[in-house]
């Protein structure tokens, strides 16, 4: 399966949201900074499969819209790029839907990623009882956003390397 | 390959205005935040302050808020750090060195070569 | 503001020598301390972050320690290249703060 162009720049428009939803001074936030260890070794084009690298970033796209959607998060961004951020990853996950089923047949596909998947939602959950434990506070939550466009930016880049490969 | 390349070595005179650039190649330059740290001769390293290109928000060192100004242009990679009035208290090796913003990662893992700059009458 | 105190100011070793250098912080700053050397006529570099983590391509002779306030970062076994100036620098909170330096000269 070819990642098509569209889901690439859906990509960057989906960072571009993330950036422009930052409403307070980031530089108030550095005693906040958390390791959060992300699972690096599952976007890794080099040891995984294809379909098990497009499998963890369709989990990672599903994550984050699940983060984004809850009560607290609506509370913390401005609505209208909250919405349009859903859009761009409602989009995604349609793409990367249509891409996993081309590249292997539905019933492999739950056996074959599960240690993947497990690891990227072992990540989302890390993340969510940080969020609890800094109790939802604006630093903790742009900490998250700081952290999800790092691993958006990585997963962008390997999936240029994926679409290198065909 | 990660690199900052700064401008070159500068002599300016008391009271005049200096502007310095360090640019950011091999890296996507809005991911990372930009440093500026100040060494006189023979002395330790001092943080003067920082940006984060992706907005251009800054925050001084409270020693150097008011002194210096601090800013980037994104679409050419390039952060730089002015004065407006310069003192021979000034001369020192500037460097510029990029911080991993509130992301869990080494900070001020790649440094620019410096600037030089000396004020003298 | 943050202070951060280096001991000792210089100390002289031989090659081979194991050197530890510490650092305190007049506060709490968790592990949030990265440690550079910086040789004359060039940029820092850094050896170690978040007190104890070996920054990529640092030799394995380096290490850190410590959390709180109390740090040490220790040389095994000291190479001709490594005579140089250590200064740590905390990266809890702004104004970002450094040490005052460890001058490494050769015995």
């Known amino acids: 399966c070819d990642l098509p162009q569209t889901h690439s720049l859906g990509n960057r428009r989906a960072l571009i949201l993330l950036a422009q939803m930052g409403r307070i001074s980031h530089f108030s936030c550095l005693k906040d900074r958390y390791d959060f260890g992300f699972p690096q070794e599952v976007f890794d084009g080099n040891q995984f499969q294809k379909a098990q690298a497009i499998s963890a970033f369709h989990e990672m796209i599903q994550q984050t819209f699940n983060l984004f959607s809850t009560k607290d998060s609506s509370a913390a961004w401005d609505e209208t790029l909250l919405d349009k951020f859903y859009i761009e990853l409602f989009q995604q996950l349609n793409d990367l839907e249509a891409c996993v089923t081309q590249e292997v047949g539905v019933e492999e596909i739950a056996l074959m990623n599960e240690d993947s998947i497990l690891a990227v939602r072992k990540y989302f959950q890390r993340i969510t009882l940080y969020l609890m434990g800094k109790k939802y506070s604006p630093c903790a939550w742009e900490v998250v956003r700081a952290e999800i466009m790092r691993s958006f930016s990585f997963s962008t880049n390997l999936q240029k390397g994926l679409r290198r490969k065909d | 390959e990660v690199q900052l390349v700064q401008s070159g070595a500068e002599v300016k005179k008391p009271g005049e205005s200096l502007k310095i650039s360090c640019k950011g190649s091999g890296y996507s330059f809005t991911s990372y935040w930009i440093g500026w740290v100040r060494q006189m001769p023979g002395k330790g390293l001092e943080w003067m302050g920082i940006?984060?290109?992706?907005?251009?928000?800054?925050a001084y060192s409270p020693s150097f808020q008011g002194q210096v100004t601090i800013s980037a242009d994104k679409s050419i990679s390039t952060a730089y750090l002015q004065w407006s009035s310069l003192k021979a208290s000034d001369t020192a090796m500037y460097y510029c060195?990029?911080?991993?913003?509130?992301?869990?990662?080494?900070?001020?893992?790649?440094w620019g070569q410096g600037t030089l700059v000396t004020v003298s009458s | 503001d943050i202070q951060m105190t280096q001991s000792p100011s210089s100390l002289s070793a031989s090659v081979g020598d194991r050197v530890t250098i510490t650092c305190r912080a007049s506060q709490s700053i968790t592990n949030f301390l990265n440690w550079y050397q910086q040789k004359p006529g060039k940029a820092p570099k850094l050896l170690i972050y978040f007190a104890s983590s070996l920054q990529s391509g640092v030799p394995s002779r380096f290490s850190g320690s410590g959390s709180g306030t109390d740090f040490t970062l220790t040389i095994s076994s000291l190479q001709p290249e490594d005579f140089a100036t250590y200064y740590c620098?905390?990266?809890?909170?702004?104004?970002?703060?450094f040490g005052q330096g460890t001058k490494v000269e050769i015995k």
């Open positions: 060195a990029r911080h991993p913003g509130l992301n869990w990662a080494p900070d001020f893992d790649y």
């Open positions: 620098q905390q990266s809890l909170d702004f104004p970002l703060t």
């Open positions: 940006i984060d290109p992706s907005d251009s928000d800054t």
